[in-house]
């Protein structure tokens, strides 16, 4: 049951509706739960999650990562250049859930859902961006050269691969909802 | 096999209370929020009631507001729909439906139940 | 009364391209994604495209969807006979803080 969760029957009291923002709050939330069943089954599939960050670190993957020019913590803060890192950030991680897809057994469908209900919220991001014209999409070209790489890779990379796609995501979703909460 | 299997339609009075069920499997049901669409005999869809994820939350349409309550059992892997004073206009098929899209804007419905009917008449 | 419009029918011979409108209002498709179902005669609706413009997995590249200001689309291009269906728009609608679907399109392959 993920966080959250009761796992009661749950008639639900009359609450008021939930705010855009709020609803940005729990999307993340949500992701995050879903990427949390993920990490399980890769933790528990291979040893991965036993190694250390140094060794994990020496790849060549280009996973989004918040900087201090990215205005996203409080010290420097810029909502607009936050928010624009933000969107640029979860668009660029887009091939990477695209590569998570058929990594999994027992939590495919999860797999499916935190790539589904992320494209969900850049849309929602999208038009909360006064600056849509900074936000650079990726190249599809780029992308599917870069996912027939990565799916090319022998299992014990694409093991690795899976577990820092994941940590990455999870760290960058951590960084966005702390940001998104001070908008 | 992913599957959402509705039960507890039927023909009901005027006035009258019915509980459907809709049971599902092959899926982490308690990661996903869930909705009730009704359709009324030769007319379009009509979203009626959706639980988010995290069960305390729900909304529903302003025609059923007050009268209809949705809930879950993630234990029993169960959506329920409480419907109380029906209404000849809620005479529709019910179909219950997984969203997937997670807390923004309802989801987007990616599984369908085969739909239950209830007809409301005396 | 739907608070998305959509024509009630829509026609196109074998391989032809169809487009269905969508149409709505800052509320609704102005703020939020749309979603495309496709009901075919006697079952119940399918997921035809999110987040405006995305296919779920199964759903053939001949169906696109696409989004401009309060106003969307769904195409089919290279129309099949087992396209005949009916197809539903719908957005979350913040006024209404609900889920409103389309009126429905009858798509008949001639």
């Known amino acids: 049951v993920p966080p959250g969760e009761d796992s009661k029957d749950v008639a639900a009291p009359h609450r008021q509706p939930l705010t855009s923002s709020e609803r940005i709050d729990k999307q993340i939330r949500y992701i995050l739960d879903g990427i949390s069943a993920l990490r399980k089954e890769t933790c528990n599939k291979s040893n991965m999650c036993e190694s250390s960050k140094e060794a994990l670190a020496e790849n060549n993957l280009n996973l989004p990562k918040m900087a201090e020019k990215d205005g996203c913590f409080q010290s420097g803060f810029n909502e607009e250049t936050c928010l624009v890192k933000i969107i640029t950030g979860l668009l660029e991680f887009e091939v990477y859930l695209e590569y998570l897809q058929n990594r999994f057994e027992s939590s495919e469908e999860q797999a499916r859902a935190v790539q589904m209900s992320t494209k969900v919220l850049i849309q929602f991001l999208q038009k909360k961006a006064k600056n849509l014209d900074a936000i650079t999409t990726p190249d599809p070209t780029t992308n599917a050269s870069l996912l027939t790489k990565l799916q090319a890779q022998n299992q014990w990379l694409q093991d690795m691969t899976t577990h820092l796609i994941l940590r990455s995501f999870k760290e960058f979703l951590q960084s966005s909802l702390r940001a998104l909460r001070q908008m | 096999e992913v599957q959402l299997l509705e039960s507890g339609g039927g023909l009901v009075q005027p006035g009258g209370s019915l509980r459907l069920s809709c049971a599902a499997s092959g899926f982490t049901f308690s990661f996903y929020g869930m909705a009730w669409v009704r359709q009324a005999p030769g007319k379009g869809l009509e979203w009626v009631s959706s639980i988010y994820p995290s069960g305390g939350y729900t909304d529903y349409a302003d025609s059923v507001k007050g009268r209809f309550t949705i809930s879950r059992d993630n234990s029993k892997n169960t959506l329920y729909l409480q419907m109380n004073s029906l209404r000849a206009e809620d005479t529709a098929v019910y179909y219950c439906?997984?969203?997937?899209?997670?807390?923004?804007?309802?989801?987007?419905?990616?599984?369908w139940g085969q739909g239950t009917m209830v007809t409301v008449s005396s | 009364q739907s608070e998305l419009t959509q024509p009630p029918s829509a026609s196109g011979t074998p391989g032809q391209r169809v487009t269905i409108s969508c149409s709505g209002s800052?509320?609704?498709?102005?703020?939020?994604?749309v979603n495309w179902y496709q009901q075919l005669p006697g079952t119940a609706p399918k997921l035809l495209i999110y987040?405006?413009?995305q296919r779920p997995s199964g759903v053939p590249d001949r169906f696109s969807g696409s989004k401009s200001g309060t106003s969307a689309s769904l195409a089919i291009s290279g129309l099949q006979s087992e396209d005949e269906a009916d197809y539903y728009c719908a957005a979350w609608d913040d006024s209404l803080n609900g889920y409103v679907f389309g009126i429905g399109t009858k798509v008949t392959v001639l």
């Open positions: 987040s405006n413009n």
């Open positions: 800052s509320s609704n498709i102005g703020s939020n994604t």
């Open positions: 439906a997984r969203s997937a899209g997670g807390w923004i804007g309802g989801g987007a419905f990616d599984i």
